[in-house]
Interface confidence: low
């Protein structure tokens, strides 16, 4: 029977610098169980080396010298008794590139180099990047464990050193950032920032890094309401806004959050199932009416929580004046002025630019004021005839503005008749 020496191993293998590779291998050799049982030794040699005195790259023979440059990096894996010659190569170096052959020795009879099945190893530049693993989504305030690992790396060779960098890590102890794992409690402001893990093999020039952009989920922390690009002041979840009646109003509600909160506007203080008047962050009123006083609520809905702000709208108006108009009545000249304003205005009468305040002590004039709905009325009664042409004015004012009107009273009662005095406003 012909002696059978066979080796199953791949012809070539490629590995990136600094990484590991496992080369599966099996062999057979002639052996009879009635032989004596000397130990079975196997060896991997660099191609071209002479087995009898060359240093090996890997062996199970404790008495053979191993090349210092492959010591601990090239290892036999598996059970050689079961004819497993698999070779593990760790922390691959450029200088490892080349051919290798396998040899078996057992007693005097079995000494064989499998020269016809050489292993060609090619070490290429490191392009593999580490992976940063963490459970997504990152949630603001929730501690999350991140780990950094390099696919294809293993324990062989000098240890790997890690360094983490990124704005989200600023408060951490520097020592923490030198481990392959770290615990991060992200903040809303960490959303969109970069986190980098860099790996380096101690004593080697090989470094690689991976940068990820953090996607931090966070509920809205604040709501800001903008009018014409200017933020309104918010106190205790309420903002106050005075608006001129009839004016167009465009408000923008903003609630930074990730993913973006669903923003909506409601009239008044809404119930949970209320229907919004706007399903965006924008509230537009073409003409503000006094009926809209009371306000609106901007609500930001988010999977992690919701927030709302009440906008107390105070609708104001400049005084609107009707009059004055004057007529002769039994008790004398009766002048009336009507006005409307929010807030309610003050009013004064003038006779020839001289203010008429209260009621005359001599009884020469009398002022009465009343209000009905949004309008207020004031009347002035002048007793007696006119000695000359007179100008009667009424003026209404509030904090937002004033308006006045006047009428020229012509001398001689006959000129006036009983109707309205001709006015020169």
């Amino acid at each position: 029977e012909k002696p059978v020496y066979e080796l199953q191993v791949q012809k070539s293998v490629t590995v990136q610098e600094g990484l590991c590779v496992l080369v599966p291998c099996s062999f057979s050799y002639p052996w009879r169980s009635w032989y004596s049982s000397p130990p079975l030794y196997v060896y991997w040699f660099r191609d071209g080396e002479i087995p009898y005195y060359a240093e090996v790259v890997a062996t199970n023979n404790p008495d053979r010298r191993v090349k210092p440059e492959t010591q601990g990096r090239f290892r036999l894996l598996g059970d050689v008794q079961k004819k497993n010659c698999s070779l593990s190569i760790g922390d691959a170096r450029m200088e490892d590139t080349g051919s290798y052959f396998f040899r078996v020795e057992r007693g005097r009879d079995v000494k064989y180099s499998y020269q016809q099945n050489k292993l060609n190893l090619e070490v290429t530049a490191l392009i593999e990047k580490p992976d940063i693993h963490f459970l997504e989504p990152l949630e603001s305030g929730r501690p999350t464990r991140l780990s950094c690992s390099l696919p294809g790396s293993c324990e062989a060779g000098p240890p790997l050193t890690f360094s983490w960098t990124g704005n989200a890590l600023s408060p951490l102890d520097p020592e923490t950032t030198r481990s392959s794992e770290l615990t991060l409690t992200p903040r809303p402001e960490d959303h969109g920032t970069n986190l980098t893990c860099q790996m380096k093999r101690q004593g080697a020039q090989v470094t690689t890094e991976r940068t990820v952009q953090l996607n931090v989920s966070y509920a809205p922390q604040t709501i800001t309401i903008f009018r014409n690009g200017i933020a309104l002041e918010i106190l205790q979840n309420t903002s106050y806004l005075p608006v001129l009646e009839g004016q167009a109003l465009r408000l923008l509600c903003d609630a930074p959050s990730n993913p973006p909160a669903h923003l909506s506007w409601f009239q008044g203080s809404p119930a949970l199932n209320a229907t919004p008047i706007s399903n965006t962050g924008i509230l537009e009123l073409r003409r503000v009416r006094s009926a809209e006083e009371g306000g609106f609520t901007c609500r930001a809905q988010h999977p992690l929580g919701f927030l709302q702000i009440f906008l107390n709208l105070s609708v104001y108006s400049l005084p609107q004046l009707l009059g004055p108009s004057c007529s002769w009545e039994a008790e004398g000249l009766h002048c009336r002025c009507s006005f409307r304003a929010r807030p309610a205005p003050s009013l004064c009468w003038r006779l020839e630019e001289k203010p008429l305040e209260g009621n005359s002590s001599q009884g020469s004039f009398k002022v009465n004021s009343s209000s009905a709905g949004p309008w207020a009325n004031s009347s002035l009664i002048l007793h007696g005839g006119l000695s000359s042409d007179l100008k009667v004015s009424c003026k209404a004012w509030n904090i937002y503005g004033s308006q006045s009107g006047s009428v020229l009273l012509l001398q001689g009662r006959s000129n006036l008749g009983t109707g309205v005095v001709p006015a020169a406003l």
Partner: antibody, heavy 118, light 107 residues
């Protein structure tokens, strides 16, 4: 009162297509996403996808992509789901429902039974 | 996709009893979970939103609890009209996903 009124049951042949409608009333139609949910006989509920009536933009669950086309007609406040290349696997009750952000899915249509049979 | 697991397919209870239906999410979904009741031949009825809030008109014997990944719907003082199938649903991320359902049987 908010209501979602769906079209009636459909019996169709394999390979054919069908269009299910959902008419919304009682709220501002363009303000909320309209969801379509599938429930096969005796099984759980599966989200088919949704459409934003405001801009007509659909989102399809990857599992059902290519099976349905979602559209809306804003003028009649109606959402449509067009199912194509029907097989017996598509026999199910299809519901429309509107999604209200933080509040989930408070309102559902009465469902439309689609039966695919030769 | 987030998987919502309702491990109990059937639950048996008596009128007046208290029963808890559980639901587990494969990822943290915060409190974005809703519960629905479905009776044969009817569309689902919304019971609970945001894990613990009852929709208006839902009897207060229905209560929801939980956050993160574990959620519970509790029905205290079970009534015969509560005979139905109950589904949980997450709306934390698309696509919205539902549990497989738990059928409540009245002894």
């Amino acid at each position: 009162e908010i209501q979602l009124q769906q079209s009636g049951p459909e019996l169709v042949k394999p390979g054919a297509s069908v269009k299910v409608s959902c008419k919304a009333s009682g709220y501002s139609f363009t303000d909320y996403n309209m969801y379509w949910v599938k429930q096969s006989h005796g099984k759980s509920l599966e989200c088919f996808g949704y459409i934003d009536p405001y801009n007509g933009g659909p989102y399809y669950n990857q599992k059902f992509k290519g099976k349905a086309t979602l559209t809306v007609d804003k003028s009649s406040s109606t959402a449509f789901m067009h199912l194509n290349s029907l097989t017996s696997e598509d026999s199910a009750v299809y519901y429309c429902a509107f999604y209200y952000g933080y509040y989930g899915v408070p309102y559902w249509g009465q469902g439309t039974l689609v039966t695919v049979s030769a | 996709d987030i998987v919502m697991t309702q491990s109990q397919k059937f639950m048996s209870t008596s009128v007046g009893d208290r029963v808890s239906v559980t639901c587990k999410a494969s990822h943290n979904v915060g409190t974005s979970v809703a519960w629905y009741q479905q009776k044969p031949g009817q569309s689902p009825k919304s019971l609970i939103y945001s894990a613990s809030y009852r929709y208006s008109g839902v009897p207060d014997r229905f209560t929801g609890s939980g956050s993160g990944t574990d959620f519970t719907l509790t029905i205290s003082n079970v009534q015969s009209e509560d005979l139905a199938e109950y589904f949980c649903q997450q709306y934390n991320s698309y696509p919205l996903t539902f549990g497989s359902g738990t059928k409540l049987e009245i002894k």
